[in-house]
């Protein structure tokens, strides 16, 4: 049967516009004589289906709403509002172009109080910086504003003669943006020599150079060994940006670790990411299934090591730190990282890196017949010959006669699709001339040597080690407060670079976040804008797991810790894909604020609280203490104020100032005061009948907070249980007559235990059906048989438990709701099977790590130190992020878990070691 005798219909429209739909067509069959005689029914397929619109659906970038305007910063007279990227754009969706932070000028309601450093016995520069007294009048501009060299009778020179600074010394003092992989503004002032005449000699010049105070040591050298060209082969970019032994990971005081691509390092500690170059490489790899070969060579001019402490900060950085407010302000604090980077250089080299990344078609490389090692070798040989012009380069037969080279007049490099320049250092025009162009005739002989020569005058910092910029915030006013705020800001800031916000990429591509756009880094054998295309030999269906974003930090628990978690669900591993690497839960020590509601205190490095008291005025002119508004008080309270002095009006807790909050003392002894009042921002604890208990019991409740009313045992609330603070009143309104009524559960119980009723002089179990039709409070209950939890009325639960339903376990009072209480309830049920103590307590049963409270008949967890040693239920565990093993008893395990601390049970019994 010739099937095409019966033509196909048109393809139907695609079932989806994106994300892989299907379409079908069918044969237009006429059951004629030919059809029957030639067995066409059996031979011809009647319908065909194919995949269509396989490209991923575009995800448009989505910005959140702006938060409120920050307080007006009285020092810069600006305020800001911030919004975050709720969802980055992906798969060609619309980008976000609007700013995330907006500033506007404003009229401050507070005075600008930049804390000044207390120079004690040091010299104070006009800029406010403190320097050693010995630096006055030494003929050197140690202050930076020359104020230490004013009014000098005689100057005593530090050095016997004048020395030049080390060339490009300022580069070593720049900040480095770890997440963007580039240097930023100057953080260390490397022109400051600290009154010490320390010099260093270079073999290239006869005059020694002066060593700045910030540098521990400097060593000049020039490395241009001809054979130190290194080559790397990458099947795809996932390994380039994810190289396990060279991953750039920075863990900010318990913050998330962010891996960033490293483009050159001869030290494993270096972290470098050329964002634009990596993006270029990703986009190139989308065009076709690609492999990459990278060739690189390092030239060093000098090595340097920065001092470990007492570093002299640049004026611009110091000013930026001094202008930071004590109150945490996300926009102002994260701006430090934009301007100055996230890290500073602790050691490194100045020099240049010749570094090119060649993109080859995987198909063409495979067909060339060369192994990976051979392709690397050919790239190295040809670079030596055509770029470095090394005279004694022996070109090997294999490199010129393979299928790829033969297509391009014996050149292997000309077979590349494109190259991406990662060259650093040297004059830009020479660096640009070294970049390889497809089809170009090759380089002139002196191009490389010109660039190499220019590296000496125009070096870059290469091969470096970093430390967080936060560590530099020392010996400035309020250093501890500002360090803590900067740490918090770094965690917020770094989260913006975390690809956890991206949707999973097709074909196991790895998402990477570039600004507000997610890009897909394709696995070997896949290509397309979003890695949605497969080459014929790509057969894998595995999906590697990727982390979702971290939850916010929990509050601090009784063991000085707070924690956060993330899930391996973006996507979860499927079909044999790799599990997520790294920790699911992070724990860190808490930093505590000493003053809870009085704004951020200024804590200095010596950890002393600084309280600035205005001196008492003994003159009798001025103004007496003014009368504050209702529910307000005067901040800087004293008997008499001098003319021109301001007083600040503050409001009691639960109220906030509306209007201009400063009064000024006038020459006639009166106060100039605008309209200011203290308006309530919270609800007052409601007045209820004494029998009712309010939980949580506070004086004031913030808007959105709720309370619950409860009654003594045997009674229930005769009305709603839950009330919420809205505006400055309770919803629903709380009636004065609200009271407790007798609980029918208790009436039935008589003198019997819970779940039983009196029948004559006997106690028998209640019937869940007959005796529990009345209202009783909700409990959250776990059924070990069905391995499920559910909400049950207390009466029904107790009756069923009495009827010996041992599989029912009390989790907590109230209906089941996801959260820590439910989590813990389930976990304690699991632990309870090994408990040596089972003590009945109200609805509950208390275990080894708990105590039954007499007053409330509830099980309360012991704190770990309250556990008694020993018992035969021992476990070998790992605690927190520690790697060491520890033997704990069941009480300690239960108490630690109840406190929400991480403890991993390795095996029952003592640890073996």
């Amino acid at each position: 049967c010739f099937c095409d005798h019966y033509p196909w219909s048109q393809w139907s429209s695609c079932s989806k516009t994106c994300n892989s739909g299907t379409q079908s067509r069918h044969r237009q069959i006429v059951v004629d004589k030919y059809y029957q005689e030639n067995f066409c029914e059996q031979i011809c397929s009647k319908q065909e289906t194919r995949e269509c619109n396989w490209q991923s659906c575009p995800i448009n970038c989505l910005l959140g709403d702006f938060g409120p305007w920050s307080d007006c910063d009285p020092c810069v007279e600006k305020q800001s509002k911030v919004r975050s990227v709720l969802r980055p754009s992906q798969f060609g969706g619309q980008p976000c172009t609007e700013p995330l932070v907006v500033f506007q000028p404003c009229i401050p309601s507070k005075l600008c109080k930049i804390e000044e450093a207390d120079c004690k016995n040091k010299f104070r520069c006009d800029s406010g910086r403190c320097i050693a007294r010995k630096l006055e009048c030494n003929g050197e501009n140690d202050c930076g504003d020359n104020s230490d060299e004013r009014d000098c009778g005689r100057t005593k020179a530090v050095c016997a003669r004048k020395y030049n600074p080390i060339p490009s010394v300022q580069l070593m003092g720049n900040g480095f943006h770890f997440l963007a992989g580039e240097p930023r503004g100057e953080v260390l002032d490397n022109s400051f020599t600290g009154g010490i005449c320390k010099t260093v000699k270079s073999s290239r010049t006869s005059n020694p150079y002066r060593v700045p105070a910030n540098l521990e040591n400097v060593g000049f050298e020039v490395e241009t060994a001809e054979d130190d060209l290194k080559t790397d082969f990458y099947k795809d970019l996932t390994s380039l940006g994810h190289n396990e032994n060279q991953q750039g990971s920075f863990s900010s005081q318990g913050g998330s670790s962010f891996r960033v691509p490293i483009f050159y390092s001869s030290k494993r500690s270096e972290n470098v990411n050329h964002n634009s170059a990596f993006k270029q490489a990703i986009q190139a790899s989308h065009k076709k299934d690609s492999s990459f070969i990278r060739i690189h060579k390092v030239m060093k001019v000098l090595n340097f090591t920065t001092k470990a402490k007492d570093l002299y900060l640049s004026d611009v950085f110091l000013k930026a730190l001094n202008h930071l407010p004590l109150e945490y302000n996300s926009a102002l604090y994260t701006r430090i990282f934009d301007d100055f980077g996230t890290h500073y250089f602790t050691s490194g080299s100045l020099g240049g890196v010749y570094d090119l990344l060649y993109q080859f078609s995987s198909e063409e490389l495979k067909n060339s017949g060369l192994t990976e090692e051979e392709t690397k070798h050919c790239v190295r040989i040809e670079t030596k010959k055509r770029v470095l012009f090394v005279k004694k380069t022996k070109v090997e037969h294999r490199c010129t006669t393979n299928k790829l080279s033969e297509k391009h007049e014996g050149s292997f490099l000309q077979g590349a699709e494109k190259s991406i320049s990662l060259i650093r250092g040297g004059r830009s025009e020479y660096a640009a001339a070294l970049a390889w162009e497809k089809g170009s005739s090759g380089l002139e002989e002196k191009t490389f040597s010109d660039w190499l020569e220019s590296v000496k005058e125009n070096p870059a910092v290469i091969d470096f080690e970093l430390a967080p910029i936060v560590d530099l915030v020392r010996n400035i006013p309020c250093a501890v407060t500002k360090r803590n705020n900067l740490r918090k800001a770094f965690q917020e800031y770094a989260a913006k670079f975390d690809p956890c916000q991206c949707a999973p990429c097709p074909n196991n591509g790895r998402p990477t976040l570039s600004g507000t756009e997610c890009l897909c880094v394709c696995q070997s054998g896949t290509y397309g804008e979003n890695c949605e295309r497969r080459s014929p030999d790509y057969k894998s269906n595995a999906v590697d797991g990727h982390w979702g974003c971290w939850s916010s930090w929990s509050t601090c628990d009784a063991t000085y810790k707070r924690s956060r978690t993330r899930e391996c669900s973006n996507p979860a591993p499927k079909r044999g894909g790799k599990r997520c690497e790294g920790e699911k839960r992070q724990e860190e020590d808490c930093t505590f604020s000493i003053m809870e509601n009085n704004g951020q205190p200024c804590i200095n490095d010596d950890e002393e609280m600084k309280e600035v008291n205005l001196p008492e005025i003994e003159a009798d002119s001025g103004c007496p203490q003014p009368v504050p508004p209702e529910n307000g008080f005067i901040r800087n309270e004293k008997k008499l104020y001098s003319v021109g002095e301001d007083v600040e009006i503050s409001c009691l807790t639960g109220f906030e100032t509306v209007g201009y909050q400063y009064f000024r003392c006038l020459p006639d002894g009166t106060w100039r005061q605008g309209d200011v009042e203290c308006q309530r921002t919270e609800c007052i604890k409601p007045v209820v009948q004494e029998i009712l208990t309010i939980t949580p019991f506070q004086r004031l409740y913030r808007i959105g907070e709720s309370i619950e009313l409860t009654c003594p045992k045997g009674f229930v609330v005769a009305g709603p249980l839950r009330y919420t603070c809205q505006g400055n009143s309770w919803t629903p309104p709380i009636s004065n007559s609200l009271t407790c009524e007798k609980d029918s559960l208790t009436k039935l119980k008589g003198h019997c235990q819970l779940g039983q009723k009196q029948s004559g002089s006997e106690c028998i179990c209640m019937s869940p059906e007959e005796d529990c039709s009345h209202y009783s409070e909700d409990l959250c209950v776990f059924d070990t048989d069905s391995n499920d939890y559910f909400t049950s009325p207390a009466c029904k639960f107790l009756a069923e438990k009495c009827l010996n339903n041992q599989q029912l376990h009390f989790l907590h009072i109230g209906s089941c709701q996801d959260g820590r209480q439910l989590e813990w309830g389930l976990e304690r049920t699991r632990l309870s099977s090994n408990s040596t103590k089972k003590e009945s307590c109200g609805y509950d049963t208390c275990y080894d790590w708990e105590k039954c409270t007499a007053s409330t008949s509830k099980c309360a967890c012991l704190l770990p130190p309250q556990c008694f040693k020993g018992g035969n239920q021992l476990y070998c565990v790992k605690m927190g992020s520690s790697t060491s093993e520890k033997t704990l008893n069941i009480c300690e395990v239960g108490a630690i878990r109840c406190a929400n601390r991480k403890v991993e049970i390795l095996h029952p019994g003592k640890c073996l070691a």
Partner: antibody
Framework: EVQLVESDGGLVQPGGSLKLSCVAS????????MAWVRQGPTKGLEWVAT????????YYRESVKGRFTISRDNAKRTLYLQMDSLRSEDTATYYC???????????WGHGTLVTVSS | DVVLTQTPSTLSATIGQSVSISCRSS???????????LYWYLQRPGQSPQLLIY???DLGSGVPNRFSGSGSGTDFTLKISGVEAEDLGIYYC?????????FGAGTNLELK
Amino acid sequence: EVQLVESDGGLVQPGGSLKLSCVASGFSFSDYYMAWVRQGPTKGLEWVATINYDGSSTYYRESVKGRFTISRDNAKRTLYLQMDSLRSEDTATYYCSRPSTEALFAYWGHGTLVTVSS
Amino acid sequence: DVVLTQTPSTLSATIGQSVSISCRSSQSLLNDVGNTYLYWYLQRPGQSPQLLIYLVSDLGSGVPNRFSGSGSGTDFTLKISGVEAEDLGIYYCMQASHAPYTFGAGTNLELK
């Protein structure tokens, strides 16, 4: 009956060192965590440090970390507090304390006075 | 650190009178599994502190039941129903819900 007896404190100069000890009786010493709590003339009661049964885990308040060391000798039924780099703000009566299932600081010694002054 | 504010700082009472002491916390002491680690201690003149109340409202061993504790969240109260001569001294509240453990500044109960 649970008894906790602290050694005599004394007068120490700022920057100096002192080691306090606390002998326990009336209970199985090695079965309990132990702690030091102090009561200063201005600061009131302050928890200082805690140690677990065998001394493998220790916990300190931030202001004494790196200067004070809590340790124990279960054979001698004795708890120690080694205090180095003493400051005037460390002046206080130091109590040795044992927990129970009711509270972290259920039993207290009689206390010993440490004065840091030049 | 969590700050515990006790009021009043001094309390004068006559024998047999009922009195209350308040302890207010700078943040809620109710943890996420429903436990509140708030304790009351009495320090008689020249003696060490002695546990009176644990977990807000439970009576310590051997403590007479004229002492009672109540409260939740951030507001807590110790009540003595009928003061006796042996009750004189300084009363401290203490929290262990958040690290580091902290004590209130104390309330001195004296005879009128």
